[in-house]
Interface confidence: low
Amino acid sequence: YDFTNCDFEKIKAAYLSTISKDLITYMSGTKSTEFNNTVSCSNRPHCLTEIQSLTFNPTAGCASLAKEMFAMKTKAALAIWCPGYSETQINATQAMKKARKSKVTTNKCLEQVSQLQGLWRRFNRPLLKQQGSSDYKDDDDKHHHHHH
């Protein structure tokens, strides 16, 4: 799916109002410096591509994120604010159903959600520019390897 046509501001609003809180809840009890960011994105459509992949595609060691509250709210936001997104997810639903066996929070899932938090932060300030300067507010962000 090409995320270029999404209403990014509406998705940002959904993230700030609820999704971010659900991610924090999921990560509660985890040290903020426990995981390094290894996944990044360069612009908003690219960020949404990576967010969709990490949220909904089962991975080795973490097969159950799709039914978490933050995932359901992410799916709802994309369905509402990305034209045609819902239609592309019909085939993906079957794969998601197969993944819904047990709700187990593994360390791998925690690491994956930590990556998601980084992607969402990048989505919310894609270029991190300061007015009147070509410098970055957080130079580590520019190089995509900062810690939480």
């Epitope: 090409d2 270029t4 509406k10 612009n43 270029l127 520019k129």
Partner: antibody
């Protein structure tokens, strides 16, 4: 300093194709989008499409779909717009415009000087 | 496609007067950008995201609006302000309005 330098004016016959280049400098080419906008004589600006140099992803104005192709050469920091099956109404100035994210919105903050394409038999 | 309608098409005013340019979207958009264009030149960003002036734009310019109705206002026209102004949205792809030409009366 951000600069977008476009290729020179073109004169084409109806039915032919034209490929306009846009050489970017002064910023990281893959960090921002590149739009293509045209303006027929005395007419409004008309958005044609957008490309992400990062991954080559494109989105086109439906009016031009099938006739316009946007590509990039990352190594040369150059964006290209090719328009095929030219007709007289395609006579216009074609602009490339970098799209940056600032002020909570994507905006075309730097523009090329424009390339005049004349379609005439 | 979101259609942007600018009015009036032409605004004939004298230096020192107030100019109000309107841009109406066919459906709600998050923000509106404005560009200034003078004859033979490429457009220049003028107002970002509804109300933020681009670098070098004088404070006599202001932008406002939300939803489907947006406005660019010039409090006191100076000779260099006479030009064509285009609105542009990006909520759904990108489209430009038809432009408002501000000309000397």
């Amino acid at each position: 300093e951000v600069q977008l330098v476009q290729s020179g004016a073109e004169v084409k016959k109806p039915g032919a194709s034209v490929k306009v280049s846009c050489k970017a400098s002064g910023y990281t080419f893959t960090d921002d989008y590149m739009n293509w906008v045209r303006q027929a004589p005395g007419q409004r600006l008309e958005w044609m499409g957008i490309i992400s140099p990062y991954n080559g992803g494109t989105s086109y104005n439906q009016k031009f779909k099938g006739r316009v192709t946007l590509t990039v050469d990352k190594s040369a920091s150059t964006a290209y717009m090719e328009l095929s099956s030219l007709r007289s109404e395609d006579t216009a100035v074609y602009y490339c415009a970098r799209e940056d994210y600032d002020y909570d919105g994507y905006a075309m903050d730097h523009w090329g000087q424009g390339t005049t394409v004349t379609v005439s038999s | 496609e979101i259609v942007l309608t600018q009015s009036p098409a032409t605004l004939s005013l004298s230096p020192g007067e107030r100019a109000t340019l309107s841009c109406r979207a066919s459906s709600s958009v998050s923000y509106m950008h404005w560009y200034q264009q003078k004859p033979g030149q490429a457009p220049r960003p003028w107002i970002y995201a509804t109300s933020n002036l681009a670098s070098g734009v004088p404070a006599r310019f202001s932008g406002s609006g939300s939803g489907t109705d947006y406005t660019l206002t010039i409090s006191r026209l100076e000779p260099e302000d006479f030009a064509v102004y285009y609105c542009q949205q990006w909520s759904s792809n990108r489209t430009f309005g038809g432009g408002t030409k501000v000309e000397i009366k």
